[in-house]
């Protein structure tokens, strides 16, 4: 990758952790009333998330992830939930790279859609400090 | 077998610069990550860098603009290119292989780097 | 940037017993916790991976426990041979850090 490809990896990167923390903050906002029920549903977490290779496994989780939105008020995000899940596997699918022979492994416990997003916002935020 | 040779170690001065090397043998080098760590005289375990099997690079801020982690899987070799050198990185230089969902699996013999006057 | 801490750089023990390392994380990193033996003058080698599967030829004598924040590796029925430096490194994240260290020695 060049100087400027990887400019670009940072701001896709930085494009990807506002979406997800956008997300994170609308069904933490205090007056969903679908949190209860959004909490019951259980996504995979990867084995590993470090590497931009490692985005296959969130790339698999984007459609349960808009099940899950779709519960929510819509009020609560400024975009409707297939928007923005489709902006973000537009990100994905850029940032992963053609790799299609990738398979994910995941972690053997699932976790919430709250612990699944700061999983993903957790990554975001380390390679954005650590790609050069 | 999985084998990894680190060469290029040597005493160089404050401010100068070396280029670490790094032979792989036994696997499937361009699908990998490789990273290098290091280790200060009696001290412990440091992660340098880490390139990808896409080239991207990554690192900690304590060696960013100084060091350069790069990839020739045409010849199965790691390289690290270390400028601006300080006393503070005096240390064994370990390449080793960044298993694609595990822990670092393998490690090298390392090579000494002494950066001192 | 996630710490990793071994508060026991030195534990004594002898051939045959049995010996317990701890390491302890800054932050939650799940199960994504390595463990490796120095020897001394000799490179790492890594023996846990995913807090408690031994890589292929480690001895059932090494055990990896833990997930979240506390981890330890257990040597039982501890040989000579074992003398050596162990550290617990995370890979939850970027950058990779490693705990100080922990020298086993042999009574």
């Known amino acids: 990758p060049t100087s400027s490809s990887t400019k670009k990896t940072q701001l896709q990167l930085e494009h990807l952790l506002l979406d997800l923390q956008m997300i994170l903050n609308g069904i933490n906002n205090y007056k969903n009333p679908k949190l209860t029920r959004m909490l019951t549903f259980k996504f995979y977490m990867p084995k590993k998330a470090t590497e931009l290779k490692h985005l296959q496994c969130l790339e698999e989780e984007l459609k349960p992830l808009e099940e899950v939105l779709n519960l929510a008020q819509s009020k609560n995000f400024h975009l409707r939930p297939r928007d923005l899940i489709s902006n973000i596997n537009v990100i994905v699918l850029e940032l992963k790279g053609s790799e299609t022979t990738f398979m994910c492994e995941y972690a053997d416990e699932t976790a919430t859609i709250v612990e699944f997003l700061n999983r993903w916002i957790t990554f975001s935020q380390s390679i954005i400090s650590t790609l050069t | 077998e999985v084998q990894l040779v680190e060469s290029g170690g040597g005493l160089v001065q404050p401010g100068g610069s070396l280029r670490l090397s790094c032979a792989a043998s036994g696997f499937t080098f361009s699908s990998y990550t490789l990273a290098w760590v290091r280790q200060a005289p009696g001290k412990g375990l440091e992660w340098v860098a880490a390139i990808d099997s896409s080239s991207y690079t990554y690192s900690p801020d304590t060696v960013r603009g100084r060091f350069t982690i790069s990839r020739d899987n045409a010849k199965n070799s790691l390289y690290l290119q270390m400028n601006s050198l300080r006393a503070e990185d005096t240390a064994v230089y370990y390449c080793?292989?960044?298993?694609?969902?595990?822990?670092?699996?393998?490690w090298g013999q390392g090579t000494t780097v002494t950066v001192s006057s | 940037d996630i710490v990793m801490t071994q508060s026991q750089k030195f534990m004594s023990t002898s051939v045959g017993d049995r010996v317990s390392v701890t390491c302890k994380a800054s932050q939650n990193v799940g199960t994504n916790v390595g463990w490796y033996q120095q020897k001394p003058g000799q490179s790492p080698k890594a023996l846990i991976y995913s807090a408690s599967f031994r890589y292929s030829g480690v001895p059932d004598r090494f055990t990896g426990s833990g997930s979240g924040t506390d981890f330890s590796l257990t040597i039982s029925n501890v040989k000579s041979e074992d003398l050596a430096e162990y550290f617990c490194?995370?890979?939850?994240?970027?950058?990779?850090?490693f705990g100080g260290g922990t020298k086993l020695e042999i009574k």
């Open positions: 080793a292989r960044d298993s694609n969902w595990d822990a670092l699996d393998y």
């Open positions: 490194q995370q890979y939850y994240t970027y950058p990779y850090t």
